[in-house]
């Protein structure tokens, strides 16, 4: 059985999508920071229907490695996803590793593909740069989840973000569309054009298929 | 189990400046203030984490309020100035277990105090 609970905003994402938050845990971002970050994923999750059937979400905060908080596949209610999402802890690390993140989504989160019909969409939200060593894979991967059919949205915050590897992401295919903004606090003002792009890139529900017209009898 | 005390509250005219105080009896990752005008909820107005001292203000008072806090003393600070008569409120303090909920939201607070009433006369 699903569970679901009532839509909190007027928008409300309908369609079947697989959504991983990705969230940059070096200290680039203070903790306050990384506060509106996780507050805006909430936001996010408030406005899309949480369930197996409709929107599936993951969230993971990313340093040198990555810690998945929740999977595609837990089966909780939306508001305790939201509660779990809100309770990721600040790394404030050195390094964020987008390379890392990107792999772990690729051979981990859509290692096998279970909902072929569901668009799946990786939220990067990064805010700083990883060491040149730590990059050498990067677009192999990019190009590894284009193959999955996973679209890359990028989101740069702040002066830090690596803009080379947002145009990288972009490059790769016309979907991944990045966002680049100058500081959290222009999250919230992105955030219902954000939510708008990826459940338009997911596609609606087929109609529920009916039993074919019974012939009608007419006695005469 | 942390205990909270605030003070600092009174009555101050439009355009004038106050300073809260909030002593914790232990260490705290988190410390917010928040503030319920006469007849309204209770609305978040700044937080200051410990570990690396970075800080949230509501964009309704930025630029006139600031949160600080003295580590030594276990303290956090409300800074008030060019206070307007909107500002009248009971301010609480407050702080949390863990991080579960928004920083803005009231239910992500384990421990509050009783509050302390700023009353700005115009």
């Known amino acids: 059985k699903d569970i679901s609970e009532p839509p909190l905003h007027d928008f409300y994402c309908s369609r079947l999508l697989d959504l991983v938050f990705l969230l940059d845990g070096s200290s680039r971002l203070s903790e306050a920071e990384f506060e509106v970050l996780k507050a805006f994923v909430v936001d996010m999750m408030e406005r899309l229907r949480i369930s197996q059937k409709w929107v599936r979400v993951a969230v993971v905060e990313y340093h040198d490695g990555s810690h998945a908080y929740i999977g595609l596949k837990d089966r909780k209610r939306p508001s305790e996803l939201r509660r779990i999402a809100s309770q990721v802890k600040y790394a404030g690390s050195q390094v964020a590793s987008t390379s890392e993140v990107l792999k772990y989504t690729l051979f981990q989160i859509f290692s096998k593909i279970d909902r072929p019909e569901a668009s799946r969409i990786a939220l990067l939200l990064m805010a700083s740069q990883e060491p040149q060593r730590m990059s050498r894979n990067f677009v192999r991967y990019v190009q590894g989840l284009k193959k999955k059919k996973v679209i890359v949205i990028p989101v740069g915050i702040g002066p830090h973000a690596n803009l080379k590897q947002i145009r990288l992401i972009e490059k790769q295919a016309p979907e991944n569309k990045a966002f680049v903004l100058s500081s959290v606090d222009e999250l919230e003002q992105q955030r219902d054009e954000i939510v708008s792009y990826l459940c338009d890139l997911a596609p609606e529900a087929p109609p529920p298929t009916l039993p074919p017209h019974m012939a009608q009898v007419t006695v005469g | 189990q942390v205990q909270l005390q605030d003070s600092g509250g009174g009555l101050v005219q439009a355009g004038g400046s106050l300073r809260l105080s909030c002593a914790a009896s232990?260490?705290?990752?988190?410390m917010a203030w928040f503030r319920q005008p006469p007849g309204k909820e209770r609305e978040f107005v700044a937080v200051?984490?410990?570990?690396?001292?970075?800080?949230l203000v509501a964009a309704s008072v930025k630029g006139r309020f600031t949160i600080s806090r003295d580590n030594a003393k276990n303290t956090v600070y409300l800074q008030m100035t060019s206070l307007k008569p909107a500002d009248t409120a009971v301010y609480y303090c407050?702080?949390?277990?863990?991080?579960?909920?928004?920083?803005?939201?009231?239910?992500?607070?384990?421990?509050w105090t009783g509050g302390t009433q700023v009353t700005v006369s115009s």
């Open positions: 200051i984490y410990s570990s690396d001292g970075s800080t």
């Open positions: 232990g260490r705290t990752k988190d």
């Open positions: 407050a702080t949390s277990r863990g991080y579960s909920g928004t920083y803005y939201s009231t239910s992500r607070y384990d421990y």
